[in-house]
Amino acid sequence: APSCPQNVNISGGTFTLSHGWAPGSLLTYSCPQGLYPSPASRLCKSSGQWQTPGATRSLSKAVCKPVRCPAPVSFENGIYTPRLGSYPVGGNVSFECEDGFILRGSPVRQCRPNGMWDGETAVCDNGAGHCPNPGISLGAVRTGFRFGHGDKVRYRCSSNLVLTGSSERECQGNGVWSGTEPICRQPYSYDFPEDVAPALGTSFSHMLGATNPTQKTKESLGRKIQIQRSGHLNLYLLLDCSQSVSENDFLIFKESASLMVDRIFSFEINVSVAIITFASEPKVLMSVLNDNSRDMTEVISSLENANYKDHENGTGTNTYAALNSVYLMMNNQMRLLGMETMAWQEIRHAIILLTDGKSNMGGSPKTAVDHIREILNINQKRNDYLDIYAIGVGKLDVDWRELNELGSKKDGERHAFILQDTKALHQVFEHMLDVSKLTDTICGVGNMSANASDQERTPWHVTIKPKSQETCRGALISDQWVLTAAHCFRDGNDHSLWRVNVGDPKSQWGKEFLIEKAVISPGFDVFAKKNQGILEFYGDDIALLKLAQKVKMSTHARPICLPCTMEANLALRRPQGSTCRDHENELLNKQSVPAHFVALNGSKLNINLKMGVEWTSCAEVVSQEKTMFPNLTDVREVVTDQFLCSGTQEDESPCKGESGGAVFLERRFRFFQVGLVSWGLYNPCLGSADKNSRKRAPRSKVPPPRDFHINLFRMQPWLRQHLGDVLNFLPL
């Protein structure tokens, strides 16, 4: 077959080819930020000629044109300046209201490099209607100016702009408009990952919150867990594998879907995941009817086995057939469970469609969506039971109208997005499911996104201050209890002056709490073995502090998961009959277990906990410490089996002031405290200028650094004695 000509350069931009110069290859243009390619793409036809999708006239030279944002068509009850036909990137538009009207939304908006306005639609409202004035987004025209219960407003976009959101909205009895705000956008515009992740995440969290009724009950935790177990989510992942998707992009689709699966399984809900790849025909790789769809590893391995070449013979984009296979799956499950049963009716369904273009065969995908809505009986009362997310990737031939038609429309939420490329998709899926926004006491959740603050990454982390100076660290293990080291409290029992500083989203300095009571392990006595020549002994170096008030859960304050509790069992996604031994075997399962602690400056530092034979050689070094242990004969007199050991090779060593802080591991996007920092042979902070300076021990140091942490698996009786009514412990 003839190849297509290579004179396809774009001035000021670059291009990529999905399958070289061969027929069927898609050429995609890209331009620097603030410019867009015209045309966006070309397809190599079997005749050896390039064709521009949607173009009627012959091939024109590809150019990078400046991005512009749409102008307001009308602005009610106020004025806007400057008045232009469209606005350049970086250009501003300002809004003011007439007397008697109050401005809601953004008074000044700036045109962003993706052709989208920042901020929110400006509305001049006098509060007269049953519903607030829904406003008119930039570039839109609205018909309907009554805002009473039952009144409808309709929107259309001016000139060649595309409408996303709801073209018709109704004022509902609760004073909220149905659907989602319509936005008029340039056909070439796309969404930035940093906008999509929170929008997608908010919507998803709403759905997961509804699936996980823990937030709605004030009953005992045992009851709470039963309720949690009754929530069920079916997640359907639809991956476009058509000709225009390159193999590399398909890999990123798969990777992004894996991230999503991984993240969704970290929620404490029951979830079944279906995987469907599609081109001209759909291929079901995992069905929700298969028991394996509830098993994260099985789902991920079926994703990994998804093969780009599976769809070699049919390379069109049949979105209808893909959605129809979801419908058929739902139909089978309904017949299996019984249409009238709670088991069927209480399942929530989320469909995520990852595509790079418009459907070009098989009929309108909207028909399949209508069938799905019908079988799930989606009406105003059951609106929460279905969410369809339509994500277009590659801004080239993506059909905004179609995506918008497929995506769900819910107030304050967005379900249809177009991203510039698969890298952006990956970023979105990395950050969208930020469980840390949940307000209940779900444990072990840290915000892992790149722009999160240190406190958001480790929201359990607290600082303990005897008077003014910080002394020790600790970890929230519930909304009122902190776990720390006993050796921090050496002034007898007067804790009236002590404070615990807990993370607070409203203040970078955190919030101070008084201590209601301190429970210090009675077994702790630093001088216990002085007569054996052991000048300091840290056995039982553990304490609990009950704060004077409960901590309000937030992105900055949330407990860590304690192993051997039901809470941790849920987070580990272990079966109900699991024991404390099972948790230890799962978490401390290697000779060298990667773990972390939090530094004085709040950053997360890495260590390796040595287990088994390696624990013995890690601890042996203590015999070289002649000042603290002048005539030590048996290392186990000092390093009992209560301690975990780290500090070999590239490990960071904790400073004295980091004592009491959690030693924790990450599993399934959740964090589990296995130890607490107790004592060590080297202090990297000693005499430093400030909290950001740490000194590595010289290689020649004798003894070399070693750090010892109280092993929480060895402190179970004491923890159970004092936290029995705070946490739900598993059998030993």
């Epitope: 008077k467 300091e536 400073c655």
Partner: nanobody
């Protein structure tokens, strides 16, 4: 907060010895890590030695290891620094410091003495 007062500084020949003392007022002396710092003219204040609140563990700057010994007497609320084999580069004002955590971060220390001058010269 602990109040601290150093003494024992003076002029000494290279190779000689001195013993610095630091007396602390406040009943909480026994719960503090104690340390010595020094500052030579035109230089930054630097860590010299520290001792844990128990007296069981000590740390020294590499430059003084083997020559200086830190000790404490909790019954007398006093900290000591025995300095042997003194060198010209040990000339500085010596300060004693108290720190509850034991890290002795310069930015966080709020209990310092006034300092005592040690001059090593022939």
């Amino acid at each position: 907060q602990v109040q601290l007062q150093e003494s024992g500084g003076g002029l000494v020949q290279p190779g000689g010895s001195l013993r610095l003392s630091c007396s602390a007022s406040g009943h909480t002396f026994r719960s503090y890590y104690m340390g010595w710092f020094r500052q030579a003219p035109g230089k930054e204040r630097e860590f010299v030695a520290s001792i844990s609140w128990t007296g069981g563990s000590t740390e020294y700057a590499d430059s003084v290891k083997g020559r200086f010994t830190i000790s404490r007497d909790n019954s007398k609320n006093t900290l000591y620094l025995q300095m042997n084999s003194l060198r010209a580069e040990d000339t500085a004002v010596y300060y004693c410091a108290a720190d509850y955590s034991g890290d002795f971060l310069l930015s966080d220390l709020d209990s310092w003495g006034q300092g005592t001058l040690v001059t090593v010269s022939s």
